[in-house]
């Protein structure tokens, strides 16, 4: 099939001791090969500080996956989710302030 770019959605949820879990979800993409990683100041976080979900079919002939990490509250601006898929790429910020969701569809 033809390439379908991912929808990327960044969310954050508060956890204890001033840390936040940030999750980057990529969905509705094809083919299944994708790079999804958290960056701090543009530098990829080490593998042992990130948790990845499997790349799974989402039932529409496309795929979905996610990556999560924990960051210190107040440092959200330093972090972005980096995505590469079928020659396209993008960086996606952690939502700031009261906005806890960020959606972006790649074209």
């Amino acid at each position: 099939g033809s390439t379908v770019p991912p929808m990327v959605n960044v969310t954050c949820s508060e956890v204890s001791e001033g840390n936040i879990t940030v999750t980057c979800r990529a969905s509705s993409f094809y083919p299944r090969n994708i790079t999804l990683t958290w960056r701090q100041d543009g530098v990829s976080l080490s593998h042992n500080t990130q948790q990845w979900g499997d790349v799974l079919p989402d039932g529409n002939g496309t795929y979905q996956t996610w990556v999560a990490t924990r960051i210190r509250q107040g440092e959200e601006q330093r972090f972005t989710c980096y995505m590469e898929h079928s020659g396209n790429h993008g960086t996606h910020p952690v939502p700031s302030g009261n906005s806890h969701h960020h959606h972006h569809h790649h074209h």
């Epitope: 100041d41 530098v43 972005t80 790429h89 960086t91």
Partner: antibody, heavy 118, light 108 residues
């Protein structure tokens, strides 16, 4: 081959502004941050700030944020550093650098000497 | 701000000798955020070691890095003539990003 090519040396008077450019090639410009660092004569390295060209996010070293503006033009793969209200202490070589996969500064421009003198 | 203090300021050695450069941080840093750069006169800095102990592309195996917490070390096992330069450590864990003041390795 990744290359960062900076604009030429500048001589400025105190109180003036200077704008230094950094043209990137050999990679997808919007996939990496561009950092700016300066080095006064005979001194060490000092981080000024960076820009994520994809989303336009800029993070400044608070020490510089009142006088520095970092921008990027994705159509020409060029980043810019503008420093205003120049003083003699701003005399330095200004470097642009690209963020790497595993380190903050993996490729560097050749540097631009800015001399502030009356 | 995390202050990085490098010692010694100058190291005078002969080719073939071992060089040990230290970098001490004012606060603890994750080893993932400590990097080393080499700068020769009139040149831009060059990434040497990333994440404490990993050699950057094209860097000879005589260079090595180690450390954790607040104390980090760059070692050159046997100095070659092209190794005489200034070496900087840098931390990327906290803003502002900071560099050490440098250690100059000069020919004795």
């Amino acid at each position: 081959e990744v290359q960062l090519v900076q604009s030429g040396a500048e001589v400025k008077k105190p109180g003036a502004s200077v704008k230094v450019s950094c043209k990137a090639s050999g990679y997808a410009f919007t996939s990496n941050n561009i950092y700016w660092v300066r080095q006064a004569p005979g001194q060490g390295l000092e981080w000024i700030g960076y820009i994520d060209p994809y989303i336009g996010r800029i993070i400044y070293n608070q020490q510089f944020k009142d006088r520095v503006t970092i921008t990027a033009d994705t159509s020409t793969s060029t980043a810019y550093l503008e420093l205003s209200s120049l003083r003699s202490e701003d005399t330095a070589v200004y470097y642009c650098s690209r963020s790497g996969e595993r380190s903050n500064f993996d490729y560097w421009g050749q540097g631009t000497l800015v001399t502030v003198s009356s | 701000e995390i202050v990085l203090t490098q010692s010694p300021a100058t190291l005078s050695l002969s080719p073939g000798e071992r060089a040990t450069l230290s970098c001490s941080a004012s606060s603890s840093i994750s080893s993932n955020y400590l990097h080393w750069y080499q700068q020769k006169p009139g040149q831009s800095p060059r990434l040497l070691i990333y994440r404490t102990s990993n050699l950057a592309s094209g860097v000879p195996a005589r260079f090595s890095g180690s450390g954790s917490g607040t104390d980090y070390t760059l070692t050159i096992s046997s100095l070659e003539p092209e190794d005489f330069a200034v070496y900087y450590c840098q931390q990327g864990g906290s803003l502002p990003l900071t560099f050490g003041q440098g250690t100059k390795v000069e020919i004795k």
